[in-house]
Interface confidence: low
Amino acid sequence: GDTRPRFLEQVKHECHFFNGTERVRFLDRYFYHQEEYVRFDSDVGEYRAVTELGRPDAEYWNSQKDLLEQKRAAVDTYCRHNYGVGESFTVQRRVYPEVTVYPAKTQPLQHHNLLVCSVNGFYPGSIEVRWFRNGQEEKTGVVSTGLIQNGDWTFQTLVMLETVPRSGEVYTCQVEHPSLTSPLTVEWRARSESAQSKMLSGVGGFVLGLLFLGAGLFIYFRNQKGHSGLQPTGFLS
Amino acid sequence: IKEEHVIIQAEFYLNPDQSGEFMFDFDGDEIFHVDMAKKETVWRLEEFGRFASFEAQGALANIAVDKANLEIMTKRSNYTPITNVPPEVTVLTNSPVELREPNVLICFIDKFTPPVVNVTWLRNGKPVTTGVSETVFLPREDHLFRKFHYLPFLPSTEDVYDCRVEHWGLDEPLLKHWEFDAPSPLPETTENVVCALGLTVGLVGIIIGTIFIIKGVRKSNAAERRGPL
């Protein structure tokens, strides 16, 4: 492979915004490999060496009054300017989440399971995901992947609830996000559709069978009782 | 007080590869980068270009300065080379996986330097290039780099995928595997027993009940035909 030594220069011109553009901090940062060696901080107003490596630059740049004036003005001419240009598609960008709930493991009822609330494709990253069991918030046994950046201006997160699902329980994943006017909820019931249809079929069949049996016995015995006085000669050969 | 938003104009120049990058970052997402070869602005999302513009030529001038700076710093540091930091690699999907529902595999390459990496998608061990895309090198707060690679795919139980990453910090290529995890249906023992018993009892009940109803009705009819003595 290519084993030649590598040399890397990085420059980061940073704009930090607080309360919109009310307070802005500008940083002009220079790095050799990963080591920052000199920086201009708008809170300081001049270049400062971060390591000994940057001392000559701090001295050289601080001697250039035009350069310093340009950097001191950068909070307005560069930061606030760029914020204004990009605000509509960055700061104001809103994409609502898609929410899906499913069990991580396919376990029978009354066994330990992880209920997954998958929240996908949202922007910005600030989000609140809560779990409820039968309307009561579950705070213990909640595990999250944390915020995952997809690299395409969307985020995703998985929030899991460790639980022992019992028949008839209703689990709710509630999501709050800047794109939503009211919380988004998705329910999960502690029984699968196939299990539910099996139970319904079984119980339904059983009840229907009992009804038929009951009706049959009722009709049969009612007729037997109703005609008992007329029967003695009925079986004469 | 924590800042609400951060915009970073991030640049780098790497020798002896003579590779440079110029990009704008908003809260960790790329707004655009400049394609050095084509000398043009490339917006991360197409719609961004409808709201703003950037003169790519300015980025080339900045990179020229970064290059000169690097030569000075290389010499000033007595030619101290960079220490390779190998990447951490994660493969995930864009959304929950459903069979035959289009999805996207994401290979997230993180916490590495220098910003040179070779990434290959493999389907069943063979390289895939159709539809693949990638981001440029994205800056991190610790001044290492991040990068995303994407592969659109149709989930199936037959296919397995790998993201293969080569970096000077790795002794050998790193492969991160992904395959469809088909959920095995629940045993549903109780439900099965209830269903079987219920339907059996039900069926038996219906048959016996029907027999009794028929017999009962016949008996009633016979008595009526004979009438009173």
């Epitope: 000559p56 630059d57 001295e59 050289y60 | 003579q18 030529q57 080339l60 001038a61 020229a64 300065v65 290059k67 000169a68 700076n69 030569e71 000075i72 010499k75 000033r76």
Partner: antibody
């Protein structure tokens, strides 16, 4: 403002050693990234780079003239000195000193030049 | 040593556009930035273009530079009589500065 001025003999004999001094003002050779170089131009011909000294005393020489050239600096006097041994009539030229700024690659300020004739 | 190749001369009438080419190799122009100097008769060279296409303050925007691969070019639009001079391209690698042979620009008429 930045100024550079070359000084030295106008006439040297073949085989002799030429010593040229560049005295500058408006910048310091202790400033990171700054260098001072020498370039010559024979009458009616092209510019030819000879040597350069950096702020940190690193020295660079033209490959074809390396064995004959020596460059040095005196930061306190704001001077750079170039010596060239074994002079020959083909070395007759105008010798310029010039500043290479922090972002190396160009010479942004030049002296007026001094004509050196090599003749017996 | 002349490492970069320039045409010995170019000419143009006032108001016209002229270009001067400069050809090098992967190790100089291909890997680094190009500088252009103007040398008026009897004077020292003056910096005209640096970093391929950047103009120092005071240089008219009639002068522009570009680079592609291992070649560079200087374009002068709206030619004026005072543009008559010698033009030199220059590049470098880590420790060697290299010049072109120079191009004499003649303004006709």
């Amino acid at each position: 403002q930045v100024e550079l001025k070359e000084s030295g003999p106008a006439l040297v004999k073949p085989t002799q050693t030429l010593t040229l001094t560049c005295t500058f003002s408006g910048f310091s050779l202790s400033t990171s990234g700054v260098g001072v170089g020498w370039i010559r131009q024979p009458p009616g011909k092209a510019l030819e780079w000879l040597a350069l000294i950096d702020w940190d005393d690193d020295k660079y020489y033209s490959t074809s003239l390396k064995t004959r050239l020596t460059i040095s600096k005196d930061t306190s006097k704001n001077q750079v000195v170039l010596t060239m041994t074994n002079m020959d009539p083909v070395d007759t030229a105008t010798y310029y000193c010039a500043r290479s700024p922090r972002y190396r690659g160009a010479f942004d300020y030049w002296g007026q030049g001094t004509l050196v004739t090599v003749s017996s | 040593d002349i490492v970069l190749t320039q045409p010995p001369s170019v000419s143009g009438a006032p108001g016209q556009r002229v270009t001067i080419s400069c050809s090098g190799s992967e190790s100089n122009i291909g890997a680094n930035y190009v500088t252009w100097y103007q040398q008026l008769p009897g004077t020292a060279p003056k910096l005209l273009i640096y970093d391929n296409n950047q103009r120092p303050s005071g240089v008219p925007d009639r002068f522009s530079g570009s680079k592609s691969g291992t070649s560079a070019s200087l374009a002068i639009t709206g030619l004026q009589s005072e543009d008559e001079a010698d033009y030199y391209c220059q590049s470098y690698d880590y420790d060697h500065y290299v010049f072109g042979g120079g191009t004499k620009l003649t303004v006709l008429g």
